[in-house]
Amino acid sequence: LQDPCSNCPAGTFCDNNRNQICSPCPPNSFSSAGGQRTCDICRQCKGVFRTRKECSSTSNAECDCTPGFHCLGAGCSMCEQDCKQGQELTKKGCKDCCFGTFNDQKRGICRPWTNCSLDGKSVLVNGTKERDVVCGPSPADLSPGASSVTPPAPAREPGHSPQ
């Protein structure tokens, strides 16, 4: 025999207390699939959370974060404070990146500058708290006969003329 509850569409629940009729989900609750025996309580976007999408009888509310915060976790389960670029969030609040590290976003941690010499390259633009270093061509790339890459004038090394 077919379960009578399977006929209950999204937005309703199979009410066992009332001969398994399909009762509409009460306000502030929803069922996103058919055949459900209860409706789920709608998520409330309160405090630092704000409503991105309202709840309906067939779908849960979706939250994001108020300005100055950003989402973390599946479905924006948490809101974390933004910091400025060049900072990272610590237990004591936003702190500037230490020398040799940078953060170009309002979230996340400070990461070490790229070590250009590991790739045999030179530093083209120095790093800052907000930006990574820019690695230039390797010294070999700048020798006569190499492919015609024209490095910016300020980065020219002594004794090398533009190709």
Epitope: N7, D15, C22, S23
Partner: antibody, heavy 122, light 109 residues
């Protein structure tokens, strides 16, 4: 403009049939909005007839007294709901209202049509 | 579900506090709506979920109650409030959405 407009009322003889229509504009019936029918005999109380699920399922909720005589149906492509009334009696004479029962308003009737008068008389 | 409203009519003056009661034949939790109807017009939703004011309804209207006993209160009656008031169960199901038979509020004197 968000509105409900009923049509199809008029004079009908006892034992006859009538089909009322309720056209929705400015919104669509859905799982959040159920179309319902309510009637009011002259000088009498409001009387609930029934509602139909607003989405694609044909689940209806009806007052027991309507069984076998009144049927609610819906055409989603036309965003219209119907009330088929058979074996009409003098006591069915009333203004028939179409109403929107909304999840957002605790399933209260937050939007009503202007009503259409049905007179059952020989 | 049967809904019993009382009184069936009452007379009051502008500024009066008016209370109308509605009783359900079985528990309907907070699933109750109140409507106002004026002659020749369709009903207008005032309150839903027992005590939530519908959009655009003045704050002098309030609703309370849960289970089987509910109350509509008009804190200070205004000239435009003379009308008939209905309660309705919104506890969906067959026969679940019955109306009370109304309370007519008329001018005293």
């Amino acid at each position: 403009e968000v509105q409900l407009v009923e049509s199809g009322g008029g004079l009908v003889q006892p034992g006859g049939s009538l089909r009322l229509s309720c056209a929705a504009s400015g919104f669509s019936f859905s799982a959040n909005y159920y179309p319902c029918w309510v009637r009011q005999a002259p000088g009498k109380c409001l009387e609930w007839i029934g509602c139909i699920y607003g989405g694609s399922s044909d689940i209806t909720y009806d007052a027991q007294w309507t069984k076998g005589r009144f049927t609610i149906s819906r055409d989603n492509s036309k965003n219209t709901v119907y009330l088929q009334m058979n074996s009409l009696r003098a006591e069915d004479t009333a203004v028939y209202y179409c109403a929107r029962s909304a999840w957002y308003s605790g399933w209260g009737g937050d939007l009503w049509g202007q009503g259409t008068l049905v007179t059952v008389s020989s | 579900i049967q809904m019993t409203q009382s009184p069936s009519s009452l007379s009051a003056s502008v500024g009066d506090r008016v209370t109308i009661t509605c009783q359900a034949s079985q528990s309907i939790s907070n699933r109750l709506a109140w409507y106002q109807q004026k002659p020749g017009k369709a009903p207008k939703l005032l309150i839903y979920s027992g005590g939530t004011l519908a959009s655009g309804v003045p704050s002098r209207f309030s609703g309370s109650g849960s289970g089987t006993d509910f109350t509509l209160t008009i804190s200070s009656l205004q000239p435009e409030d003379f009308a008939t008031y209905y309660c309705q169960s919104t506890y969906y199901g067959n026969d679940g959405n019955a109306f009370g038979c109304g309370t007519k509020v008329t001018v005293l004197g």
